[in-house]
Amino acid sequence: IPVIEPSVPELVVKPGATVTLRCVGNGSVEWDGPPSPHWTLYSDGSSSILSTNNATFQNTGTYRCTEPGDPLGGSAAIHLYVKDPARPWNVLAQEVVVFEDQDALLPCLLTDPVLEAGVSLVRVRGRPLMRHTNYSFSPWHGFTIHRAKFIQSQDYQCSALMGGRKVMSISIRLKVQKVIPGPPALTLVPAELVRIRGEAAQIVCSASSVDVNFDVFLQHNNTKLAIPQQSDFHNNRYQKVLTLNLDQVDFQHAGNYSCVASNVQGKHSTSMFFRVVESAYLNLSSEQNLIQEVTVGEGLNLKVMVEAYPGLQGFNWTYLGPFSDHQPEPKLANATTKDTYRHTFTLSLPRLKPSEAGRYSFLARNPGGWRALTFELTLRYPPEVSVIWTFINGSGTLLCAASGYPQPNVTWLQCSGHTDRCDEAQVLQVWDDPYPEVLSQEPFHKVTVQSLLTVETLEHNQTYECRAHNSVGSGSWAFIPISAGAHTHPPDEFLFTP
């Protein structure tokens, strides 16, 4: 650690005195302190001399000697008082700038330690300090306002009692800056804008911050716009607003608009897109296939996306048949707005019934006209099967009718014994009918097919089964020839006797 001569913590001299402060260290040493007049520095290897032959009150202060090469950063200090009867204060700063909740040191240094008992801090023109101002005093450093608040940004003076009267220092302006958490908060409205050529438009860019020192501007396609700024202060925040008003928009006004705000903490920006169109538009689309197939009893949501400007004047869902004149219940129709110009309309069809298959149309209207988007809904059914014994052209024939959607495939099985359903062990013969005859195939209805199995003679201890299947499920019908006649066995518990 460097050593200072004279080896006293404080030195009191009179104005005009010669002061010599010598610092000696192991390596080179440096003097530091408040930049002030009349000092001369002389360095000679491991010592440095700070001297003046005409000390003034302005030389009052703490002088520190350091050894730059010392890794421990040791230093020594001496405080010099130049006690001027006419100047009790040496003010080291015209202005002190701190952040809120920091301690603010007002650096009025007492030039005579004897005066310490009679010091006080006041605001300029003798005004008292604001309530709750918590401060302390050090003759070496000055007055410290603890945990300074923004409201304490004032002009202060230090007061000392000299011969029964108060002597004031020059004033010190305290600037307490609000702690800025980050760049200003921004809003740019609207988030998106569409106008028809010739219409009016407004874009508002606003920024706010706890500190007044910030800039905000609006730019169009990277060109800064010259717009007058409105300023305001409310909710303890400074607000700056830029409003772009366009009476009659044209295509050159279209494009990207960015609202940009910056302060010492950085920059924030947000953007929007302005579209200028020739005329009103209305576009309907769906992410779904317009041809829908759903199993009977299940539910379906039909969704339509609408892009429109100007806004919709009307919209509705309509059932176009073919089964009944029922219309979708309004409570099942749902509208959600994604943003100003895009909406989603949903029709919920829970637990679909056979009569609800058909065409559903969404219609929408705006000043640009009306548009419709139609879905075709076909219901899927598992096959229903029935078998009868008949003679065709004199030949005994088993006739199997299967009805379902999609179109069922038909397989005939012959098995031993009398059974409701042939199992693998009993099967004697299997016939696939690749091309059953289609009896009916109307849109939105089941498809009915017919398959014929010509049997020369019915074996009485055997069962003939017609099986039909499609993507939804399968159905079957067992036919049991008996001496009194033929018996047929429908699936499950049903028994049919012709």
Partner: antibody, heavy 117, light 110 residues
Framework: QVQLQESGPGLVKPSETLSLTCTVS??????YYWSWIRQPAGKGLEWI?????????NYNPSLKSRVTMSVDTSKNLFSLKLSSVTAADTAVYYC???????????WAQGTLVTVSS | QSVLTQPPSASGTPGQRVTISCSGS????????VNWYQQLPGTAPKLLIY???QRPSGVPDRFSGSKSGTSASLAISGLQSEDEADYYC???????????FGGGTKLTVL
């Protein structure tokens, strides 16, 4: 070795505020005085003002009404704001460390600030 | 208009001794110490002399400073081509409560 680096916009519009920041590296900002100096093209140097790490500031009287300096010891940086700028404020701006007798031992490389619309 | 007065230019040939003067008043040079800075083209000023005649480490002893009354001077002996630069004097000014500078002297090595 102490190093100083200025940052801030190189172009400022008339009547707006010039803002510069000086970041100190290779040493602590604490317990030293830090100054701003400027130099118009082809001209001499002009001291703008100084700030101590406690927030004490002294400004050149000719600029005092327009200058604000601040310091952030946690980030080892100090800042200059010069308001209501005109073309006469176009200059290379330097930040530097000021010592006891008013000399500057460390300087930044300087940043040119042009005031123009 | 600078507070301290310097000649705008000076010149010399390699090996020569050149002196640059700086004139002030009682509120600056008369009562305070003088500092000198060298500014090479396109660079920041560099401290050359502080407190009238003190050289920071790394500055050759060819550079020396002196002060008398309200004037100061910088002497460069054994002039070298790399000494071609602008030189500025500076001193604390009591009325400014800060440093003032001279207008600078452009030194040309012929």
């Amino acid at each position: 070795q102490v190093q100083l680096q200025e940052s801030g916009p190189g172009l400022v519009k008339p009547s707006e505020t010039l803002s510069l920041t000086c970041t100190v590296s290779g040493g602590s900002i604490n317990s030293y005085y830090w100054s701003w100096i400027r130099q118009p093209a082809g001209k001499g140097l002009e001291w703008i003002g100084r700030i101590y790490t406690s927030g004490n500031t002294n400004y050149n009287p000719s600029l005092k009404s327009r200058v604000t300096m601040s310091v952030d010891t946690s980030k080892n940086l100090f800042s200059l704001k010069l308001s209501s700028v005109t073309a006469a404020d176009t200059a290379v701006y330097y930040c530097a460390r000021e010592r006891l007798t008013g000399y500057f031992d460390y300087w930044a490389q300087g940043t040119l600030v042009t005031v123009s619309s | 208009q600078s507070v301290l007065t310097q000649p705008p230019s000076a010149s010399g040939t390699p090996g020569q001794r050149v002196t640059i003067s700086c004139s002030g008043s009682s509120s600056n040079i008369g009562s305070n110490t003088v500092n000198w800075y060298q500014q090479l083209p396109g660079t920041a000023p560099k401290l050359l002399i502080y407190s009238n005649n003190q050289r920071p480490s790394g500055v050759p002893d060819r550079f020396s400073g002196s002060k008398s009354g309200t004037s100061a001077s910088l002497a460069i002996s054994g002039l070298q081509s790399e000494d071609e630069a602008d030189y500025y004097c500076a001193a604390w000014d009591d009325s400014l409560n800060g440093p003032v500078f001279g207008g600078g002297t452009k030194l040309t090595v012929l």
